[in-house]
């Protein structure tokens, strides 16, 4: 059937519209288009004759309009007046008419809508605000935005006038917001730009900061009044009911006793005009001493003196408080305190009792703190470490060596090779060494103050070739899915390459394996039983390539949930029971069992001859591996028959 | 199966270069080091030097300082001994020589040697 | 340089007698090598790291020493043994090699 479609069917003034013909008959001799929803000579717009491919235009025909050899016609730069049917008539080449109408509606591009109001500035729990969108048109929608969000539903929101006016009752100052209105229509959608609602409010009770009303003599009163306002309030302070100032804030440098009082702060907004008002009251206390620590040895040592720490001055009916690196006192054996606390003792001292410490004493309205104190505790020297770690190094090079010690007073240093004496520095070095700068290596620390003396022996040997390496691990027996196991190849040298094997493979990818420290050492994280295999690493340089000696790991692990045999479970009277119990573990665990829960033998196998009814019951072999600590069981229901 | 295959023998003029291949094969060359080592006829063996692939690191003896020049070309696997301002006393036979790093030890691997003769 | 001298600088053996060859050196050295070679072939390692056998070398060879004094010793003598046997120190560079021993089959 022959059918019409307009695209689009809304149109917009300006634009244009095609009206798509469907199902047009074949063997045609042409056809016409009219205004209208019947064929009417006077409404002709155009007619096509397919044999001469000619157009004719008709009465109705603007200039805007173009007929297709589909017979499809488009309208341009559409006008308000096109809105309309439109009628196509077909003309057959066996002289049969067809006719199909087709529509469309013409709309206005909206213009950018704006906002009105009937009120700029409503006072907040007394007006109401009406909103309107303007212009006014026809055929359009209107929606209405809040801080770019669809209208919330509230009962003080109201939208009449067709939705074009929104009026808010009763304004709050939640409703300073941004307004924004939209008008659409099936062409356009336009939205205004922000109008933002300025609500008047206030003043709300004034706040005073800060909160504290107790201050000591001679220090500075300084309070700071704020009260929600719109537009923002005007403050004034009163003492004792005396006007002071118009400000926001009130200053009174050291202040006495004489300024304890009640403090008023009045807020007023010009706008609104309403007052409120806060008072609070202030007490000024007389100023105490600041409390001082006296110590009775300034330079203890360390694991030998004890310190004791005085608060002074002595007064009596005072609480003394104590506070180590700002905090309260730990609960330590070595920390006491005498009946008044007013001392505090420190018994055998270590490095890390450095502090600082503060004492207080605490009248009617605070804390008055001390300066702190630190003490100078004298400690090591520590067994020095020498650094860098390698131990071998290539010919040429330069060997150069650190030593340190933790020590106070700081430690001196002293560098020996083989025994003799080099020089009294931190830092030892040799430049270009050779196989000759071979040998050991002694780092000594002296402490002064102290008169202590500890010293760190290495052993350097100086050659292109690396040795035989070795692994070191960190754990010798690791427990199966709970420790990690780190190897380390030795020795640690220079411009060194390290490789690994695991089961004469290299090794495998996994989350489990990780290489660091130069690919040195590798980790095992989460160790199982699979892991106890033979483990190699290999070191190479410029001259020379070696392995290890296999390393192999020995994974603690079970005990698993144990096997009885034999598993018959149904003996007759006058047979022998021999159970033998059996579970994965390493170290192999220890066994023992229960009948009907009553122990009985601590061994592998339970042998009960010539068994009767009496024998009949649960047998429980439990299993423990002492060296994982973890244990296991497992029950077998017996049954004998007479 | 671990290989180097050297360059030809070499015929040269005093005063000139010659420049010498070793083409390894079963191991990657950047893996480890390479060595190369001179016999003259009826003489010892001299070290001259190595050469690290993987960043061009060298290491020449003394001797043989400003004679040789090593040079690697990891895409073809090879190394090359360069030999500048030849005298009599350059003619030998040069050879390369590697250890893998999965072996235990280094030299384990020759090449099987190029003749150089300098005559005018 | 750390010099490597050899002794003696030719040897003649029997098949089936003791032969050892020493190795001395200027300075102290970890460990020393030792490289067999036949006339027209490339040198061949026998004993690395003084006394590790190499690869495919037959149990009659063996290293020994330590410091400056270093040994390698076949146990008996085979017709195939018959070469130039040189040290090799890799401890300082430049690397050294020994001026080389030459055992013949009497």
């Known amino acids: 059937k022959l059918t019409i479609e307009s695209t689009p069917f809304n149109v917009a003034e300006g634009k244009e519209v095609l009206l798509l013909v469907h199902n047009l008959p074949q063997h045609l001799f042409g056809y016409s288009w009219y205004k209208g929803e019947r064929v009417d000579g006077n409404r002709q717009i155009i007619g096509y004759v397919i044999g001469t491919q000619q157009a004719t235009p008709g009465p109705a025909y603007s200039g805007r309009e173009i007929i297709y050899p589909n017979a499809s016609l488009l309208i341009q730069n559409i006008i308000q007046n096109d809105t309309g049917f439109y009628t196509l008539h077909v003309i057959k080449s066996d002289l049969v008419n067809e006719e199909a109408t087709g529509q469309f509606r013409v709309y206005p591009e909206l213009p950018k809508p704006s906002i009105s109001s009937n009120n700029s500035k409503p006072v907040e729990d007394k007006d109401a605000v009406a909103f309107t969108c303007e212009p006014e048109t026809q055929d359009a929608t209107y929606l209405w935005w809040v801080n770019n969000q669809s209208l919330p539903v509230s009962p003080r929101l109201q939208l009449s006038n067709g939705n074009r006016t929104l009026t808010l009752f009763n304004v709050t100052r939640n409703d300073t917001a941004s307004y924004k209105c939209e008008t659409q229509n099936p062409v356009s959608a336009r939205r205004s730009d922000s109008v933002i609602l300025n609500v008047l409010y206030g003043p709300d009770a004034p706040t005073i900061s800060p909160l504290n009303t107790s201050y000591r003599s001679g220090e500075n009163l300084n309070l700071s009044c704020h009260a929600a306002s719109n537009p923002p309030a005007q403050y004034s302070w009163f003492v004792n009911g005396t006007f002071q100032q118009s400000t926001q804030e009130l200053f009174i440098p050291n202040i006495t006793v004489n300024n304890s009082g009640s403090y008023t702060c009045q807020a007023h907004n010009s706008d609104t005009g309403l007052n409120r008002t806060t008072v609070t009251t202030i007490t000024v206390y007389a100023e105490p001493p600041k409390p001082f620590i006296t110590s009775n040895n300034s330079n203890p040592v360390e694991d030998e003196d004890a310190v004791a720490l005085t608060c002074e001055p002595e007064i009596q009916n005072t609480t003394y408080l104590w506070w180590v690196n700002n905090q309260s006192l730990p609960v330590s054996p070595r920390l006491q305190l005498s009946n008044d606390n007013r001392t505090l003792t420190l018994l055998s001292v270590t490095r890390n009792d450095v502090g600082p410490y503060e004492c207080g004493i605490q009248n009617e309205l605070s804390v008055d703190h001390s300066d702190p104190v630190i003490l100078n505790v004298l400690y090591g020297p520590d067994d020095p470490t020498i650094s860098p770690s390698y131990t071998y190094y290539r010919p040429g090079v330069n060997l150069s060596l650190s030593c340190h010690a933790a020590s106070n007073p700081p430690a001196q240093y002293s560098w020996l090779i083989d025994g003799n004496i080099q020089q009294h520095t931190q830092e030892l070095f040799i430049s270009n060494i050779t196989e000759k700068n071979s040998g050991l290596y002694t780092c000594q620390a002296n402490n002064s103050a102290s008169g202590h003396s500890r010293t760190t022996v290495k052993t350097i040997t100086v050659s292109a070739e690396l040795p035989k390496p070795s692994i070191s691990s960190n754990n010798s027996k690791p427990v199966e899915d709970k420790d990690a196991v780190a190897f380390t190849c030795e020795p640690e040298a220079q411009n060194t390459t390290y490789l690994w094997w695991v089961n004469g493979q290299s090794l495998p990818v996994s989350p489990r394996l990780q290489l660091s420290n130069g690919n040195r050492t590798l980790t095992l994280f989460n160790v199982t039983r699979n892991d106890a295999r033979a483990y190699v690493c290999g070191i190479q340089n410029s001259v020379s390539a070696n392995r290890s000696d296999p390393v192999t790991l020995d994974v603690l692990y079970g005990p698993d949930t144990p096997i009885i045999s034999p598993p018959d479970s149904s003996y007759l009277s006058g047979a022998n029971l021999n159970l033998s119990c059996h579970s994965a573990s390493n170290p192999s665990p220890q066994y023992s069992w229960r009948i009907n829960g009553i122990p009985q033998q601590h061994t592998q196998v339970l042998f009960i001859a010539k068994i009767t009814p009496n024998n009949n019951g649960t047998y429980a072999c439990f299993v423990s591996n002492l060296a994982t600590g973890r244990n296991n069981s497992i029950v077998k229901s017996i049954t004998v028959s007479a | 199966q671990v290989q180097l295959q050297q360059s030809g023998a070499e015929l040269v003029r005093p005063g000139t270069s010659v420049k010498l291949s070793c083409t390894a094969s079963?191991?990657?060359?950047?893996?480890?080091?390479m060595h190369w080592v001179r016999q003259g006829p009826g003489q010892g063996l001299e070290w001259i030097g190595w050469?690290?692939?993987?960043?061009?690191?060298?290491e020449y003896a003394p001797k043989f300082q400003g004679k040789a020049t090593f040079t690697t070309d990891t895409s073809s696997n090879t190394a090359y001994l360069q030999l500048s301002s030849l005298t009599s006393e350059d003619t030998a036979v040069y050879y390369c020589?590697?250890?893998?790093?999965?072996?235990?030890?280094?030299?384990?691997?020759w090449g099987q040697g190029t003749t150089v003769t300098v005559s005018s | 340089q750390n010099v490597l001298t050899q002794s003696p600088a030719i040897v003649s053996a029997s098949p089936g007698e003791k032969v050892t060859i020493t190795c001395s050196a200027s300075s102290s050295v970890s460990y020393m090598h030792w490289f067999q070679q036949k006339p027209g072939t490339s040198p061949k390692l026998v004993i690395y790291?003084?006394?590790n056998l190499a690869s495919g070398v037959p149990a009659r060879f063996s290293g020994s020493g330590s410091g400056t004094s270093y040994s390698l010793t076949i146990s008996r003598m085979e017709a195939e043994d018959a070469a130039t046997y040189y040290c090799q120190q890799r401890s300082s560079y430049p690397l050294t090699f020994g001026g080389g021993t030459k055992l013949e089959l009497k």
């Open positions: 050469i690290d692939p993987e960043n061009g690191d060298t």
């Open positions: 790291s003084t006394s």
């Open positions: 079963g191991f990657n060359i950047k893996d480890s080091y």
């Open positions: 020589n590697e250890g893998t790093p999965t072996g235990p030890y280094y030299f384990d691997y």
